[in-house]
């Protein structure tokens, strides 16, 4: 795990996009893949386990000369909490990867509260890059305009 971070809490939630599509995890050939699609009202939504971490941001790194703290998350399908959403900086994809002991930096995302209902996930290892939706897939999106809808997600308690 990342130096200096400490686990605050963890809780399950369903993850949906700004356009009300569900993020789900489907087992294909022994591996989980991530789908973004319309789910029926009666269809049970997949859940993710969100682990919330506090990460210090020393004045030397903060850019505004004062110590700060960031709230970060990593996410696992509730079906298998030993795999994590992972930011692949080679092809700007979002993957599920099985971990050994603790998640690598690529599995951590800085949480941004964008509005009353929506959050965004900024890659810890790629500042300025967010989990987004492209062609019904999760992908990494370099966000110039942070208010862009394709990086906004709703976390819902089941």
């Amino acid at each position: 795990s990342i130096q200096g971070t400490s686990l605050l809490t963890q809780s399950p939630a369903s993850l949906s996009t700004y356009n009300d599509q569900s993020v789900s995890f489907v087992l294909e050939n022994g591996c989980y893949v991530i789908n973004v699609d319309d789910s029926g009202k009666d269809q049970e939504q997949d859940q993710v386990l969100l682990r919330y971490y506090e990460s210090p941001c020393p004045a030397s790194q903060s850019g505004d000369g004062v110590d700060g703290k960031k709230l970060m998350v990593n996410m696992s399908p509730i079906k298998d909490t030993d795999i994590w959403l992972h930011a692949n900086d080679k092809d700007y994809s979002v993957e599920l990867q099985r971990g050994d002991v603790s998640p690598p930096e690529q599995a951590f995302f800085v949480l941004h509260k964008k509005s009353s209902d929506f959050v965004s996930f900024e890659c810890k290892n790629l500042p300025g890059t967010y989990i987004g939706v492209k062609d019904n897939q999760l992908a990494l999106v370099e966000e110039k305009d942070e208010s862009c809808n394709n990086i906004m997600f709703k976390l819902s308690k089941i």
């Epitope: 605050l8 809490t9 919330y52 709230l71 941004h112």
Partner: antibody, heavy 121, light 107 residues
């Protein structure tokens, strides 16, 4: 160090608009949300609204029809306007900064000293 | 809106006493709860965030516990400077509602 300072008229007439400014220093409005909270004399705290780090704004639905929050990043200022005020809006008005970058989940770590606004003719 | 109910609304205690204040949320808020201390004529001061985390510079006699809907602020050994009003606040959803406050007075 982190500072927030509320300013504005201490007396507003009924039906007029209350206007306050929160001037901040020691942190960036692009990283931290700034909230407005009020406290009527001898009573509890009421959250009014927030200007989030990304520039989006959320309001308390009980006040939404009358309240406007805006920012002037170049002046490091966040403004509050409350229209059609009545005596019930008499309160100490505070601005406060989020504990965490980019989110409010950690509460409000730094507060201004507050400014008393009295609504009276 | 999420309602936050604090109890008691006031209490009298002596220096050295252990003091417990409870806060009940009308729906689950995970651990997104903060506690503040306010003295007369002063701004609130953050004591506890994320239900259990001590804010910077806050003495270790203050502690927080709970998750979901039930939360507690404990002062293990009350000091003269602790006589004040204490508020809980949920940060799970807007509007970020406060409890009505608990006034801790000298017995």
């Amino acid at each position: 160090q982190v500072q927030l300072q509320e300013s504005g008229p201490g007396l507003v007439k009924p039906s007029e608009t209350l206007s306050l400014t929160c001037t901040v220093s020691g942190f960036s409005l692009s990283k931290y949300g700034v909230h407005w909270i009020r406290q009527p004399p001898g009573k509890g705290l009421e959250w009014i609204g927030v200007l989030r780090a990304g520039g989006t704004i959320s309001y308390n639905s009980a006040l939404m029809s009358r309240v406007t929050i805006s920012e002037d990043i170049s002046k490091s200022q966040v403004s509050l306007k409350l229209s059609s005020v009545t005596a019930a809006d008499t309160a100490v008005y505070y601005c406060a900064r989020d504990h965490y970058y980019y989110s409010s989940f950690g509460g409000f770590a730094s507060w201004g000293q507050g400014t008393l606004v009295t609504v009276s003719s | 809106d999420i309602q936050m109910t604090q109890s008691p609304s006031s209490l009298s205690a002596s220096v050295g006493d252990r003091v417990t204040i409870t806060c009940l949320a009308s729906q689950t808020i995970a651990t997104w709860l903060a506690w503040y201390q306010q003295k007369p004529g002063k701004s609130p001061k953050l004591l506890i965030y994320a239900a259990t985390r001590l804010a910077d510079g806050v003495p270790s006699r203050f502690s927080g516990s709970g998750s979901g809907t039930d939360f507690t602020l404990t002062i293990s050994s009350l000091q003269p400077e602790d006589f004040a009003t204490y508020y809980c606040q949920q940060l799970y959803n807007t509007p970020y509602t406060f409890g009505q406050g608990t006034k801790v007075e000298i017995k």
